[in-house]
């Protein structure tokens, strides 16, 4: 017994509290009516007092005592009977609690194992679904991946087949440049041997050309000759005529002037007689320095210096500034006369300038200045035009106020970029202008957008390239 | 072979627009300078509208400013002309033309007629109700 507890209720009865681990057991116990109380007046030491008693009252007392004793012994048993039956009662009673309990802990247990059943059942199927949709979902994937199989297998076996297409092709083209590197060897050697030939043939030109440069040297010594000749049979005549002169100076006093030999200009040639187109020898004004040009004797009355010619492109005008300076090119063909001479020529007497075109459709037209002349070199031979008239525009495709001269070694117009080098050939250009008769050449059916033709734009407009052009001069007084 | 070829012309009612297009060949628009000009019957032609692609200039006659806008397609050597708000004053021929771009008088911006070595056939544009 851990703890014992003895109390009185109020009917008299006594109680007896004993305390077992969490077990709590009361007994109630009927009080003796035998019994004297503790509160009785006998005192229990009596027993210990030292004055003797008479005999009568000592066993009278110990009768006394023998019954206490007696009754103790019998409220002991009865106690302990008590006890006994109490306790199978409250056995039965702990033993049916404790069942009662266990049931209910069984119950407890059954019901918490019954929703952790529950519960696990639960999981269960929520796992169960997961793996379900995971295996969904694998099968799917599966079926992606083998249809992305397939589809790639699909993609190979036409991939292959492209290959082998292409491999087919890549053989037929191997074949076919096979084909085209023989058939380019033989075109090689066919090549090789015109050239061949070419050169054979160049060789006997070459040799034509030498024979005719010796006839032609042969023919200019001829010409010496003739014009020695000629010189002579005029000297012979001028003596004739002075000899006349003086046997007949009594009769006529006039005596004839001496034939002029040296020429200006055509209009000169013209004058002297020689009414013939053609090639003629002209001397620099005030020197000795001669110069061959081609006049015209025929056109609007003849007497007409060409001071440039194109007509066929044989020769490049894309020349230096000396070239333009001296002349180029041959008279009876293309030729610039040369800005020299034309210079001092036109600032001797006042001089026209008509510039003759042809177009590509068989069209002809001309401009006529009435007042023409170039500055000296020192001033880049700057052009003065006067007076315009004629049939190819109302203004002037040579831009006024006159330009300074420019070639590709002498660039002297007024344009950011260099006007010769990009139109080609020399010419009086502003930035650029309106006109270039000393372009570039351009063929019929090639002759228009072009940046770089012969250009007289008052005329034909932009881009047009002419088909021919004659630029001559004639003093204004002729 | 240099070549100018003009597209987009049509009829179209006052204040209408109108896209005309220059594609060009034989050349690339870099070096070259591009104006759109056009010629009404009986009159002389007039420049309308030029662009040069080496520095980006654009130049425009006084009597189309702010309603046509020039621009150019280098990758496709072509350049446009977009007409806005059209007057019947508009009604021409409209032409393109090339011009090297270098080919300018010192101290000016923009190239006298006669520079214009290159041209189209034109494409005509009718303004009318």
């Known amino acids: 017994y851990n703890n014992f507890r003895k109390s009185m209720d109020s009917i008299g009865k006594k109680q007896y509290q004993v305390q077992h681990g969490s077990c709590s057991y009361t007994f109630l116990l009927p009080e003796m009516d035998n019994c004297r109380s503790s509160s009785s007046p006998y005192v229990s030491n009596a027993v210990q007092r030292d004055a003797p008693l008479e005999y009568d009252d000592s066993v009278q007392r110990l009768q006394v005592l023998e019954n206490i004793m007696e009754n103790n012994t019998q409220w002991l048993m009865k106690l302990e009977n008590y006890i006994q039956d109490n306790m199978k009662k409250e056995m039965v009673e702990i033993q049916q609690n404790a069942v009662q309990n266990q049931t209910a802990v069984m119950i407890e247990i059954g019901t918490n194992l019954l929703n952790q059943t529950a519960e696990q059942t639960r999981k269960l199927t929520d796992v169960e679904a997961q793996v379900l949709n995971q295996t969904t979902r694998l099968e799917l994937q599966l079926l992606e991946h083998s249809l992305s199989t397939n589809k790639l297998e699909k993609q190979i076996l036409d991939q292959t087949s492209e290959i082998n297409k292409l491999q087919d092709k890549n053989s037929f083209l191997e074949k076919k440049v096979l084909a085209m590197e023989d058939k380019h060897i033989i075109q090689l050697q066919s090549i090789k041997e015109e050239k061949d030939q070419l050169q054979v043939l160049v060789s006997k030109q070459n040799s034509i050309i030498e024979e005719l440069e010796k006839k032609i040297v042969t023919a200019t010594v001829n010409n010496s000759v003739l014009q020695k000749q000629q010189h002579d049979l005029m000297e012979t005549v001028n003596n004739l005529l002075t000899m006349m002169s003086t046997s007949n100076s009594a009769k006529d006093p006039t005596v004839a002037k001496e034939e002029q030999i040296s020429f200006r200009d055509c209009a000169e040639v013209f004058k002297s007689g020689h009414t013939t187109n053609g090639i003629y020898t002209l001397t620099f004004p005030n020197s000795t320095e001669e110069i061959k040009a081609y006049c015209d004797m025929e056109a609007g009355g003849g007497g007409w210096t060409i001071i440039q010619r194109r007509e066929d492109g044989s020769v490049d005008f894309q020349r230096t500034w000396k070239e333009y300076k001296v002349g180029f090119g041959n008279p009876s063909g293309e030729y610039w006369l040369g800005n020299e001479f034309v210079s001092q020529l036109t600032n001797q007497q006042r001089y026209v300038l008509k510039i003759h075109l042809k177009d590509w459709e068989g069209n002809e037209a001309y401009s006529l200045y009435e007042h023409f002349y170039l500055s000296s070199e020192e001033l880049n031979y700057r052009i003065h035009l006067k007076g315009l008239t004629g049939t190819a525009g109302k203004i002037s495709s040579i831009s006024q106020p006159g330009n300074d001269f420019s070639t590709k070694d002498g660039d002297n117009d007024k344009c950011i970029c260099k006007c010769s080098q990009m139109l080609t050939g020399g010419w009086w250009f502003d930035a650029c202008g309106p006109s270039n008769l000393n372009g570039m050449y351009y063929p019929q059916r090639q002759n228009t957008n072009k940046f770089n033709g012969i250009k007289w734009y008052y005329w034909k407009g932009s881009g047009y390239s002419l088909k021919a052009t004659t630029m001559m001069i004639r003093p204004a007084d002729f | 072979d240099v070549q100018l070829v003009e597209s987009g012309g049509g009829l179209v009612q006052p204040g209408g627009s109108l896209r005309l297009s220059c594609a060009a060949s034989?050349?690339?628009?870099?070096?070259?300078?591009i104006g759109w000009f056009r010629q009404a019957p009986g009159k002389e032609r007039e420049g309308v509208s030029s662009?040069?692609?080496?520095?980006?200039?654009?130049y425009y006659a006084d009597s189309v400013k702010g309603r046509f806008t020039i621009s150019s397609d280098n990758s496709k050597n072509t350049v446009y002309l977009q007409m806005n708000s059209l007057r019947p004053e508009d009604t021409a021929v409209y032409y393109c033309?090339?011009?090297?771009?270098?080919?300018?008088?010192?101290?000016?911006?923009?190239?006298?007629?006669?520079?214009?070595?290159?041209w189209g056939q034109g494409t005509l544009v009718t303004v009318s109700s």
């Open positions: 033309a090339a011009v090297p771009a270098g080919r300018l008088r010192f101290g000016e911006q923009w190239y006298p007629l006669y520079e214009y070595d290159a």
């Open positions: 034989g050349f690339t628009l870099d070096d070259y300078a």
């Open positions: 662009i040069r692609d080496n520095d980006g200039s654009t």
